[in-house]
Interface confidence: medium
């Protein structure tokens, strides 16, 4: 690495280019200094004077080394279904991500433009593919021998309990009912939950454990109506 830094502006020789934090000014025909993140070019360079930089004003930013005449405006405030995971500063734009229980239906370069609540599978349907940061839950009908009696965005279809003597046969939305003798089950009792997608940037949201007999990694949050779809709850 060089022990010193050459002063700008200077004329680049043929075969050479301006260095990393410099730009070629077409008017001056010189390599000139870029402005650091959080600043913008107040006065452009000339053959004898370098770029004059100034700090970005409130609610504006520049994230990169630049020579823009004005800083960029920070995005609008996050909506109620979003969490601000990065505040607007002079060096970075505001980033809004979807809160737990929601997914990003329309993304932008950083963060999310439009969040939508995760689909809930109605009784008789279980989660085939869990929701992610950017995709909705996919529901599927419970296959013979399995059921789901909940309206949930995390529950999968569970196997019917196996009775020595069946009182009421199970169906897609109800477990089998046994006579008083002890039933056996192919899986552990209690609802089976899939983990709910949590935005990687949602560090400020404290998860609330869902009341359940079995441990769960899902979150219980007030949810609005889901868009109607096969196997999901309608309005």
């Amino acid at each position: 690495l060089p022990a010193q830094v050459a002063f700008t502006p200077y004329a680049p020789e043929p075969g050479s280019t301006c260095r990393l934090r410099e730009y070629y000014d077409q008017t001056a025909q010189m390599c000139c200094s870029k402005c650091s993140p959080g600043q913008h070019a107040k006065v452009f360079c000339t053959k004898t004077s370098d770029t004059v930089c100034d700090s970005c004003e409130d609610s504006t930013y520049t994230q990169l080394w630049n020579w823009v005449p004005e800083c960029l405006s920070c995005g609008s405030r996050c909506s109620s279904d979003q969490v601000e995971t990065q505040a607007c500063t002079r060096e970075q734009n505001r980033i809004c991500t979807c809160r737990p229980g929601w997914y990003c239906a329309l993304s932008k370069q950083e963060g999310c433009r439009l969040c939508a609540p995760l689909r809930k599978c109605r009784p008789g349907f279980g989660v085939a593919r869990p929701g992610t940061e950017t995709s909705d839950v996919v529901c599927k009908p419970c296959a013979p021998g399995t059921f789901s009696n909940t309206t949930s965005s995390t529950d999968i279809c569970r196997p019917h309990q196996i009775c020595n003597v069946v009182a009421i046969p199970g169906n897609a939305s109800m477990d089998a009912v046994c006579t008083s003798t002890s039933p056996t089950r192919s899986m552990a009792p209690g609802a089976v939950h899939l983990p709910q997608p949590v935005s990687t940037r949602s560090q400020h949201t404290q998860p609330t454990p869902e009341p359940s007999t079995a441990p769960s990694t899902s979150f219980l949050l007030p949810m609005g109506p889901s868009p109607p779809a096969e196997g999901s709850t309608g309005d």
């Epitope: 050459a6 002063f7 200077y10 004329a11 020789e13 043929p14 050479s16 301006c18 260095r19």
Partner: antibody, heavy 119, light 111 residues
Framework: QVQLLESGGGLVQPGGSLRLSCAAS????????MTWVRQAPGKGLEWVSG????????FYADSVKGRFTISRDNSKNTLYLQMNSLRAEDTAVYYC????????????WGQGTLVTVSS | QSVLTQPPSVSGAPGQRVTISCTGS?????????VHWYQQLPGTAPKLLIY???NRPSGVPDRFSGFKSGTSASLAITGLQAEDEADYYC???????????FGGGTKLTVL
Amino acid sequence: QVQLLESGGGLVQPGGSLRLSCAASGFSFTSYAMTWVRQAPGKGLEWVSGISGGGAATFYADSVKGRFTISRDNSKNTLYLQMNSLRAEDTAVYYCARQSQYVGGFDYWGQGTLVTVSS
Amino acid sequence: QSVLTQPPSVSGAPGQRVTISCTGSSSNIGAGYGVHWYQQLPGTAPKLLIYGNTNRPSGVPDRFSGFKSGTSASLAITGLQAEDEADYYCQSYDSSLSGWVFGGGTKLTVL
């Protein structure tokens, strides 16, 4: 490490031709402009010719324009100088050098090859 | 006659400071093109000492420093040592010649 190795020098009669080569290694050859610089016995350095990394742009000193041709074969990492219509005043040690990507200057030099033009 | 003008020789005693000047014109140094300095020890190829007016490549001692003002530049060597005895050349690009130009060279003698 960066290495530049010139070859092709020797004794040639006035009006004759010679082709110098410079084998480059230890760096991305296509990314750098290359140049030839000469030094007559007991004299100073004189820039002769230069070529851009891709080979599209070439530059010549007035003293060799029309007689010398610089070229490069990027597949072989080799720089060339074709010298025609040689004169006694072309007698010199010819150095090949790499041009620095940023700011300029010739940051690596070969050991040189001697060209003697004499009858 | 070189496009860039240097004194033919300079000398100094060990430990002293010497400067070598390089005078150009409005088409080279004065146009804003970088000035580069080379050291050539006897019987060897030139070595880049200073590039872009003031920059030292890694491995070059901080005893060597470059300066530029207007159409002139200079190389300063402090704490002169016997091994500094060599020829020194300045170089720049000249827009009117569309080529690189060297100074005539300066022979440094360490007394």
